[in-house]
């Protein structure tokens, strides 16, 4: 077992708003559970946008899920990772981190 | 270390306004995690009332309708509740709690108010 | 709303066994779960959270598992001190909803 290393990043999105992206990469097996949490449960899955898990040449695999926020909501969102029976919350940066 | 911890009276009315207040040490209420109500009725059920949020916004429990508000007052570093038009079976021991954002689970709770609802 | 169902609603052990109580959800919540442990006029105390994971200082015979809606809290050679009432917590969306508990007796 590689467990992922996760990461999230901001980017600015139509004014007010803020896409938040949560990546996973450098795991093995492949099966990983990576979602946003919003208040401290599930957001619901038609607002979050999942990428594929993928292959990344290194007998590893990535992938990731994005949501769109409000712009200084930042801090009601983390994103939830769960891999190989481990898991972990990681919360949005803060702006200019 | 935080310390959350509960105040109001023990006897309320019927058709009365139940109002509690919850006084928080060692954390601001406004720096982060969400400020809970709790409710146990006698028999032992819990049920999540609603809470406050470090933003100040609310969500509360759909069963309690329009009869409950959570407010805060950030300078005292105190959260409230007020539950309007009380019944004998809003009768339970209160508790209020914190949780984070990682997960809504409650580490972190005041001891009970017991809240008798009675003529 | 999602439903919690605790079973059993009592029981009785001695010390040194092995207790299971289990937690029904009324829809799938995805490991969205917490277990409390609540003594006689006191407050609930955290035990699990993510349905997996021990809370700070909780002493390892406690162990939770399950997946989908199907959870359980194992409590290996049970002690003395681990008397008391017992619930689940989902926090997969709001409403918020605990389990009715089940009472651990020492026999």
């Known amino acids: 077992t590689v467990p992922p290393m996760v990461n999230v990043t901001r980017s600015e999105a139509s004014e007010g708003n803020i896409t938040v992206t949560c990546r996973a990469s450098s795991f093995y097996p492949r099966n990983i559970i990576l979602t946003w949490r919003q208040d401290g449960v599930s957001l619901s899955h038609d607002t979050q946008q999942w990428g594929d898990v993928l292959p990344d040449g290194n007998g590893t695999y990535q992938t990731w899920v994005a949501t769109r926020i409000c712009r200084g909501e930042e801090q009601r969102f983390t994103c939830y990772m769960e891999h190989s029976g481990n898991h972990s919350t990681h919360p949005v940066p803060s702006n200019g981190s | 270390d935080v310390q959350l911890q509960g105040s109001g009276p023990g006897l309320v009315k019927p058709s009365q306004s139940l109002s509690l207040t919850c006084s928080v040490t060692?954390?601001?209420?406004?720096?982060?995690y969400y400020w809970n109500w709790i409710r146990q009725f006698p028999g032992n059920k819990l049920e999540w009332m609603g809470f406050i949020s470090f933003g100040g916004s609310n969500n509360y429990n759909p069963s309690l309708k329009n009869r409950i508000s959570i407010t805060r007052d950030t300078s005292k570093n105190q959260f409230f509740l007020k539950l309007s038009s009380v019944t004998t079976e809003d009768t339970a021991t209160y508790y209020c709690?914190?949780?984070d954002g990682r997960g809504a689970w409650f580490a972190y709770w005041a001891q009970g108010t017991l809240v008798t609802v009675s003529a | 709303d999602i439903q919690m169902t605790q079973s059993p609603a009592s029981l009785s052990a001695s010390v040194g066994e092995t207790v299971t109580i289990t937690c029904r959800a009324s829809?799938?919540?995805?490991?969205?779960l917490a277990w409390y442990q609540q003594k006689q006029g006191k407050s609930p105390q955290l035990l699990v959270y993510d349905a997996i994971t021990l809370a700070d200082g909780v002493p390892s015979r406690f162990s939770g598992s399950g997946s989908g809606t199907q959870y359980s809290l194992k409590i290996n050679s049970l002690q003395p001190e681990d008397f008391g009432n017992y619930y689940c917590?989902?926090?997969?969306?709001?409403?918020?909803?605990f389990g009715a508990g089940t009472k651990v007796e020492i026999k």
């Open positions: 060692g954390y601001s209420i406004t720096n982060d």
């Open positions: 829809g799938n919540i995805h490991n969205y």
């Open positions: 709690a914190r949780y």
């Open positions: 917590q989902h926090f997969w969306s709001f409403p918020l909803t």
